[in-house]
C-alpha cells in the first residue's frame, strides 16, 4: 500500500430502491477492482424539506474526485441528489454537506444516517 493512503476494502451498503433494483437493502459490501485501480466508498442522499433520505451507499471504483478523502463530504451547492465519496473502510457510514460558496462562509451540515 502507498504510505498515507487509506485502503478501502469494504463499505457500508444501502439501497433505498432495493425492491425495484432487486438487491440487498443493507449490508457490508466488499470492494473489488483491478489491482492498479483505487477503491472508494460513496453515499447518495436527498434532502426532502430538511429530512435526510439516503438513496444509496456502497463501493465506488477509482475516481480521482475521491482520492485521499477520509471523510465523505458533498461540496456542490444544493444538488438535486447529494453525492460524496471517500477512502477508508466504512468511511461512508457518516456523510456531510459543506457547500462551497463563493462569498459566504461554508456552513457545516453533518449527517449521521439513522440505521435502516
Amino acid at each position: 500500500a502507498i504510505l498515507g493512503r487509506s485502503e478501502t476494502q469494504e463499505c457500508l451498503f444501502f439501497n433505498a430502491n432495493w425492491e425495484r433494483d432487486r438487491t440487498n437493502q443493507t449490508g457490508v459490501e466488499p470492494c473489488y477492482g483491478d489491482k492498479d485501480k483505487r477503491r472508494h466508498c460513496f453515499a447518495t442522499w436527498k434532502n426532502i424539506s430538511g429530512s435526510i433520505e439516503i438513496v444509496k451507499q456502497g463501493c465506488w471504483l477509482d475516481d480521482i474526485n475521491c482520492y485521499d478523502r477520509t471523510d465523505c463530504i458533498e461540496k456542490k451547492d444544493s444538488p438535486e441528489v447529494y453525492f460524496c465519496c471517500c477512502e477508508g473502510n466504512m468511511c461512508n457510514e457518516k456523510f456531510s454537506y459543506f457547500p462551497e460558496m463563493e462569498v459566504t462562509q461554508p456552513t457545516s451540515n453533518p449527517v449521521t444516517p439513522k440505521p435502516p
Partner: antibody, heavy 120, light 107 residues
C-alpha cells in the same frame, strides 16, 4: 485476463426455447454480479437481465419478464439465460457482461456475444 | 424508467478533430453515467465510468464530464481507431438504460 465467452445462440422458431451460457474466467466469478444485454440487428443496446454475486437477487426488463430466467452456477463459473416463448423481436446478439460493484455502477467487461435468431 | 437521450445520432469528423457527444438523462442520475465504444461486429467496450473516470487502457484523449442530468464525452484529438459508435448508459436504477448511440464516421 478477464474473459467472458457466450454460447448457445442459434435459429429458433417463434414460441421456442433456447438456453444461453456465458463461461467466465480470469476473475473470482462468485464475487461479481452479472448481466445480459442484447442488440437487435442494426439497433442500439438493450439491458435484459441481471443477477447478483450469489444468485440471491435477479432482475429483468419488462420486455422479457416471465419468459426469460437468469441463473448462475458459481462452481462452474458460468452464467445462464433460459429463454422461453421466444418472439421475433427477441432476435439479437446477446452479450454477457460483468458488473463492477453491487450497485452495477458500470459493466466493465463484456463477452463477444452470441446471435439468437427467432424466425419461422 | 430513466430515459437517456444522446446527440447527435451521427457525426462526420476528421483525424485530429475534437469531438463532443452529449447525453441527457430524464432525471438526475448523479454520476451514474457510463460511456461505451462499439465497433462493427464487436462487443461494446467500457470507455468512461462514473461520468469522469477513464477505464483501464483507455487513452487520455477520452474524457467525460457532467453530473445530474447532462453529460459529455469528449475526444480531444480523433484517431483512426476512434471511429465507432458510442453509447451512454445510466446505472442509477434498474432497468439500466442506454442512449440511442452516436456513430462517429470519417469525413
Amino acid at each position: 485476463e478477464v474473459q467472458l465467452l457466450e454460447s448457445g445462440g442459434g435459429l429458433v422458431q417463434p414460441g421456442g426455447s433456447l438456453r444461453l451460457s456465458c463461461a467466465a474466467s480470469g476473475f473470482t466469478f462468485d464475487s461479481y454480479g452479472m448481466h445480459w444485454v442484447r442488440q437487435a440487428p442494426g439497433k442500439g443496446l438493450e439491458w435484459v437481465s441481471s443477477i447478483n454475486y450469489n444468485g440471491g437477487y435477479t432482475s429483468y426488463a419488462d420486455s422479457v419478464k416471465g419468459r426469460f430466467t437468469i441463473s448462475r452456477d458459481n462452481s462452474k463459473n458460468t452464467l445462464y439465460l433460459q429463454m422461453n416463448s421466444l418472439r421475433a423481436e427477441d432476435t439479437a446478439v446477446y452479450y454477457c457482461a460483468r458488473a463492477a460493484t453491487w450497485h452495477d455502477t458500470h459493466l466493465d467487461y463484456w463477452g463477444q456475444g452470441t446471435l439468437v435468431t427467432v424466425s419461422s | 424508467d430513466i430515459q437517456m437521450t444522446q446527440s447527435p445520432s451521427s457525426l462526420s469528423a476528421s483525424v485530429g478533430d475534437r469531438v463532443t457527444i452529449t447525453c441527457r438523462a430524464s432525471q438526475s442520475i448523479v454520476s451514474y453515467l457510463n460511456w461505451y465504444q462499439q465497433k462493427p461486429g464487436k462487443a461494446p467496450k467500457l470507455v468512461i465510468y462514473a461520468a469522469t473516470s477513464r477505464a483501464s487502457g483507455v487513452p487520455s484523449r477520452f474524457s467525460g464530464s457532467g453530473s445530474g442530468t447532462d453529460f459529455t464525452l469528449t475526444i480531444s484529438s480523433l484517431q483512426p481507431e476512434d471511429f465507432a459508435t458510442y453509447y451512454c448508459q445510466q446505472s442509477y436504477e434498474n432497468p439500466l438504460t442506454f442512449g440511442g448511440g452516436t456513430k462517429v464516421e470519417i469525413k
